[in-house]
Amino acid sequence: GITQSPKYLFRKEGQNVTLSCEQNLNHDAMYWYRQDPGQGLRLIYYSQIVNDFQKGDIAEGYSVSREKKESFPLTVTSAQKNPTAFYLCASSI
């Protein structure tokens, strides 16, 4: 399956925080989305192979890495001034 953690996270002002996303489905592609109240999902970053990733529609204030196939952590950087949202990780073949 696919596992995202933590379930809840509080960020101190000026801090970077990292959200974990791990999958054991042997999927090549992984995605991070953000959902704000009353809105649809918006793509932050996506990755289609190891060590390659592309910006989505709202990449500003976020960073990612794809060091291995199974993992695609998202860092919410201190530059992200409005981080409060629901974050969703997904994967696909």
Epitope: A29, Q48, I49, V50, N51, D52, F53, S65, E67, K68
Partner: antibody
């Protein structure tokens, strides 16, 4: 910052096995990425030989597949190249290399290179 | 294997010149994920190659803006807009879309 350093004999006799080791510092080879061997012939042509992945899986150049083995020693954070049945055509500078983050498979962390001469 | 053919194989130019090196692959370098893994390296004598451009047109960290890459499919170019003394070196294209990864034969850029 990832640093790589090749080591091994500079002279190998024809028909013998070439053995080189790459020591990695600044990053664990089990944490991610692909750990490559690339060689450069005296005429300056570059050839990708193969890699070992963070999970221990291999991908080899088919032109070398019957002769090449890339393995790793995770306790020493090293990966190694063995090339059997060498001839003078295997004389080259051998580099270990790994990709820079986010570049696909484009390598930009390189060892200094070690010159291997095949001669009796 | 994918053959990578660079032209010219050598080139003489002067400081300030605009220089273009071309690289042609024997088949398309578009990956099934729609990215194109074509890269450019610079090598100086006694040194390992250095990454200049990755994925056709992305300048690697610290690479001056006078270097640019373009192209698609099978035809690619590296352009140096205004040659500097430190740019005289050998340039290689490389593809990592298909295994085995392959390199062009190199273009040696010399001072005129």
């Amino acid at each position: 910052q990832v640093q790589l350093q090749e080591s091994g004999p500079g002279l190998v006799k024809p028909s013998e096995t070439l053995s080189l080791t790459c020591t990695v510092s600044g990053y664990s080879i089990t944490s991610g990425y692909f750990w490559n061997w690339i060689r450069q012939f005296p005429g300056k042509g570059l050839e990708w030989m193969g890699y070992i992945s963070y999970d221990g899986s291999n991908n080899y150049n088919p032109s070398l597949k019957s002769r090449i083995t890339i393995s790793r020693d995770t306790s020493k954070n090293q990966f190694s190249l063995k090339l059997s049945s060498v001839t003078a055509a295997d004389t080259a500078v051998y580099y270990c290399a790994s990709p820079s983050p986010g570049t696909g498979y484009a390598v930009d962390y390189w060892g200094c290179g070690t010159t291997v001469t095949v001669s009796s | 294997d994918i053959q990578m053919t660079q032209s010219p194989s050598s080139l003489s130019a002067s400081v300030g010149d605009r220089v273009t090196i071309t690289c042609r692959s024997s088949q398309s370098l578009v990956h099934s994920n729609r990215n194109t893994y074509l890269h450019w390296y610079q090598q100086k004598p006694g040194c390992a190659p250095k990454l200049l451009i990755y994925k056709v047109s992305n300048r690697f960290s610290g690479v001056p803006s006078r270097f640019s890459g373009s192209g698609s499919g099978t035809d690619f170019t590296l352009t140096i807009s205004s040659l500097q003394p430190e740019d005289f070196a050998t340039y290689y294209c490389s593809q990592s879309t298909h295994v085995p990864f392959t390199f062009g034969q190199g273009t040696k850029l010399e001072i005129k």
